[in-house]
Amino acid sequence: ARNGDRCPLGPGRCCRLHTVHASLEDLGWADWVLSPREVQVTMCIGACPSQFREANMHAQIKMNLHRLKPDTVPAPCCVPASYNPMVLIQKTDTGVSLQTYDDLLAKDCHCV
Amino acid sequence: ARNGDRCPLGPGRCCRLHTVHASLEDLGWADWVLSPREVQVTMCIGACPSQFREANMHAQIKMNLHRLKPDTVPAPCCVPASYNPMVLIQKTDTGVSLQTYDDLLAKDCHCV
């Protein structure tokens, strides 16, 4: 039976959520964000082999055409399926403000 | 001035909508789809250089971390921002049916 969550390439090689520890300098945010000064950035990294976490019909098509025409059509790509919100304290003209960003930290991943 | 739609790699090299002509056999659909027998598949193909069609804050972060840690963090990836619906005539146990698929043909593209 097909298992869309079993990685045929070996544990941890396929599309999944990774955490990367980053400073404001790493993110290019040092000039406008005050806090947090360190961020646990969650992002989607890994290969998208056939039938693994396919997001939709388009991903299936893309994989089939990639097999046929690998030089023309790339394999599906590991991207966020949803996001976790994150609060930043940022500089403003008049002081500081809290802003919630809804599209910053990946929550889970799929192949498109 | 930054232009999120100007490709620094040269015309047609960056993330954009491509059309790939495919048969039902190419798509692996020959056993369940009756029509159309040929599909103009629209998909997102191309590179995602810095600031090009960035979908959101996550894409910006990913690019900055890719620059810092290219072996760990991949560059953003060219994926559909939205889809066009497509109607397929497909085989059923009792005959045929028309089915609309909303996630089959890419309509426009961005980098995530």
Partner: antibody, heavy 119, light 112 residues
Framework: QVQLVQSGAEVKKPGSSVKVSCKAS????????ISWVRQAPGQGLEWMGG????????SYAQKFQGRVTITADESTSTAYMELSSLRSEDTAVYYC????????????WGRGTLVTVSS | DIVMTQSPLSLPVTPGEPASISCRSS???????????LDWYLQKPGQSPQLLIY???NRASGVPDRFSGSGSGTDFTLKISRVEAEDVGVYYC?????????FGGGTKVEIK
Amino acid sequence: QVQLVQSGAEVKKPGSSVKVSCKASGGTFSSYYISWVRQAPGQGLEWMGGIAPISGTASYAQKFQGRVTITADESTSTAYMELSSLRSEDTAVYYCARGLAYDGYFDLWGRGTLVTVSS
Amino acid sequence: DIVMTQSPLSLPVTPGEPASISCRSSQSLLYSNGYNYLDWYLQKPGQSPQLLIYLGSNRASGVPDRFSGSGSGTDFTLKISRVEAEDVGVYYCMQAIGVPLTFGGGTKVEIK
């Protein structure tokens, strides 16, 4: 309305361990850090350590290193603080607090859990 | 560890009168971005602490404007312009420039 709901009071023997829970209800859990702060009777506040639930990465005050373990379960939006080798001076109210990394801004606190260590 | 020293230990106040609490740190709390990583908290009798001021001088959401924070480097002050009966409790400063986070010993504000 987001709340941090802590587990109930505990009475423990010296040398034993205690595990206190802190559940975030009604809001996002993963994108904040959870810190643990204790307050002995009639005393001030003392930061013990904290965790980034999104990654499970914890940090501890040197004073508690080796004796405290802070964990988080994203699926249940719950953070835990386990303190081992308890002694009478660990008798305190233990608070969890939500913050932005370790930059402070503890804008939300649990109501506290009283842990009494007595033989 | 950074040592935080508050004074006075106890502060009897008259409603309607101003009050001032001092907090000194053993190391500078001024970060390279020009902001001081110092918070002020109030613990009312029988309650959990509540955030009053963050980043040295910024009032938290819902905090009355009679509360203000000032100072830089190692010397900080919390002022209440006109004390009200509901302001009684223990006030703590906390440094967040580095781990471990450390609190001042507290200042007990009570009505005369």
